[in-house]
């Protein structure tokens, strides 16, 4: 809710990783991982499995730089992109070396962000201006959710300032005098 007001405005996507926020299910490379630990089985799920942990969706690891005008984060940030539909973990691609994608015949169960985290990033700006930092809101985990006609795909909430841009958050960094804080930033202490 509150984060909704802070919209993102300046994200630089690392080209090899494709579009954001929803890479197609077939996108796979060494920067992605599939996990079966998130998401619960929605009610009336076609598969009558008692263990809700068996239902999962793909969490793609996604790397990007945070930018603001001519400034760019010293390091790229890594977050998750929730991808594809939900299904039994055993049928997810790469789960057990199988490539089949399970699709329910009933309602649309989507893989959506579940938890977020904020990470402070140091921005490097040309011309030696004062140090700046911003806080970026990143997806920390995904979950399966039954979507209704009231849902849309923009459940990603963020902090930024400009509408209709890829998600990201911003926050300037402290002055050079705060050596310990800067060090923490640079090491992605979050």
């Amino acid at each position: 809710q509150g984060w909704q007001a802070f919209k993102n405005d300046a994200t630089e996507i690392i080209p090899e990783l494709g579009e954001y926020p929803e890479p197609p299910p077939e996108l796979e490379n060494n920067k992605t991982m599939n996990r079966a630990e998130n998401g619960g089985r929605p009610p009336h799920h076609p598969f009558e499995t008692k263990d809700v942990s068996e239902y999962s969706c793909r969490e793609l690891h996604f790397t990007r730089y945070v930018t603001d005008g001519p400034c760019r984060s010293a390091k790229p940030v890594t977050e998750l992109v929730c991808s594809g539909q939900c299904g039994p973990a055993r049928l997810l691609p790469n789960a057990i070396g199988r490539g089949k994608w399970w699709r329910p015949s009933g309602p649309d169960f989507r893989c959506i962000p579940d938890r977020y985290r904020a990470q402070r990033v140091q921005l490097l700006c040309p011309g030696g201006e004062a140090p700046r930092a911003r806080k970026v809101r990143l997806v920390a985990s995904c979950k399966c959710k039954r979507l209704t006609r009231f849902h849309n795909q923009s459940e990603l909430k963020d902090f930024g300032t400009e509408a209709a841009r890829p998600q990201k958050g911003r926050k300037p960094r402290p002055r050079a005098r705060s050596a310990k804080a800067n060090q923490a930033e640079l090491e992605n202490a979050y």
Epitope: G2, G127, E129, R132, R134, R137, F159, P172, P174, A181
Partner: antibody
């Protein structure tokens, strides 16, 4: 909905200290930067400093260095600004503001009037 | 400290007018400039950041331009709700500083 609610007006004597609070709702305070800006009667805006509630980092305007302290209680999502050794020229409306950067002020509190008078 | 000088300090205009407010920095600040609107008795509101980027929800009649030391805020067609005081703010170097404000009044 993002909201910042500040504490009520204060009247102080010269030499005293004042502590203004700012309750943030709508998102966790630790995920933001907290700023303080003041405005003397009929005058413009003056930036006092910012703080990072998550790690306690701060940046104060040199004018206020040594007199101002910005802190936060992340358990209650409340920011505090304490100004000491008050003088008459500190009479102003003090605003808290928040955002995801250290350099722009996305959301503002309603302001707290601090009057310094003997 | 970087001084920010706004001109004019006040102006009178009518609804529908095109209004231009100028902000000049005492040294080069690149494009590190924000604009705020403040109505009497209220807190300021961020309108534009990084010289020309409009905050989400701000009407498109507001625009910003400039670079280096000279910047402008333009309201293409003044509306009744635009009568307020406008402030520029630099974030090129600490301390962040504001201009003295430009009050836009009804003619």
């Amino acid at each position: 909905q993002v909201q910042l609610v500040q504490s009520g007006a204060e009247v102080k004597k010269p030499g005293a200290s004042v502590k203004v609070s700012c309750k943030v709702s709508g998102f966790p305070i630790k995920d933001t930067f907290q700023h303080w800006v003041r405005q003397a009667p009929g005058k413009g805006l003056e930036w006092m400093g910012w703080s990072d509630p998550e790690i306690g980092d701060t940046e104060y305007a040199s004018k206020f260095q040594g007199r101002v302290t910005m802190t936060e209680d992340t358990s209650t999502d409340t920011a505090y600004m304490e100004l000491s050794s008050l003088r008459s020229e500190d009479t102003a409306v003090y605003y808290c503001a928040t955002g995801d950067t250290t350099y722009k002020f996305d959301f503002w509190g309603q302001g707290t009037t601090v009057t310094v008078s003997s | 400290d970087i001084q920010m000088t706004q001109s004019p300090s006040s102006l009178s205009a009518s609804v529908g007018d095109r209004v231009t407010i100028t902000c000049r920095a005492s040294q080069d600040i690149s494009n590190y400039l924000n604009w705020y609107q403040q109505k009497p008795g209220k807190a300021p509101k961020l309108l534009i950041y990084y010289t020309s980027r409009l905050l989400s929800g701000v009407p498109s009649r507001f625009s910003g331009s400039g670079s280096g030391t000279d910047f402008t805020l333009t309201i293409s067609s003044l509306q009744p709700e635009d009568f307020a005081t406008y402030y520029c703010q630099q974030y090129s170097d600490y301390p962040w500083t504001f201009g003295g404000g430009t009050k836009v009044e009804i003619k």
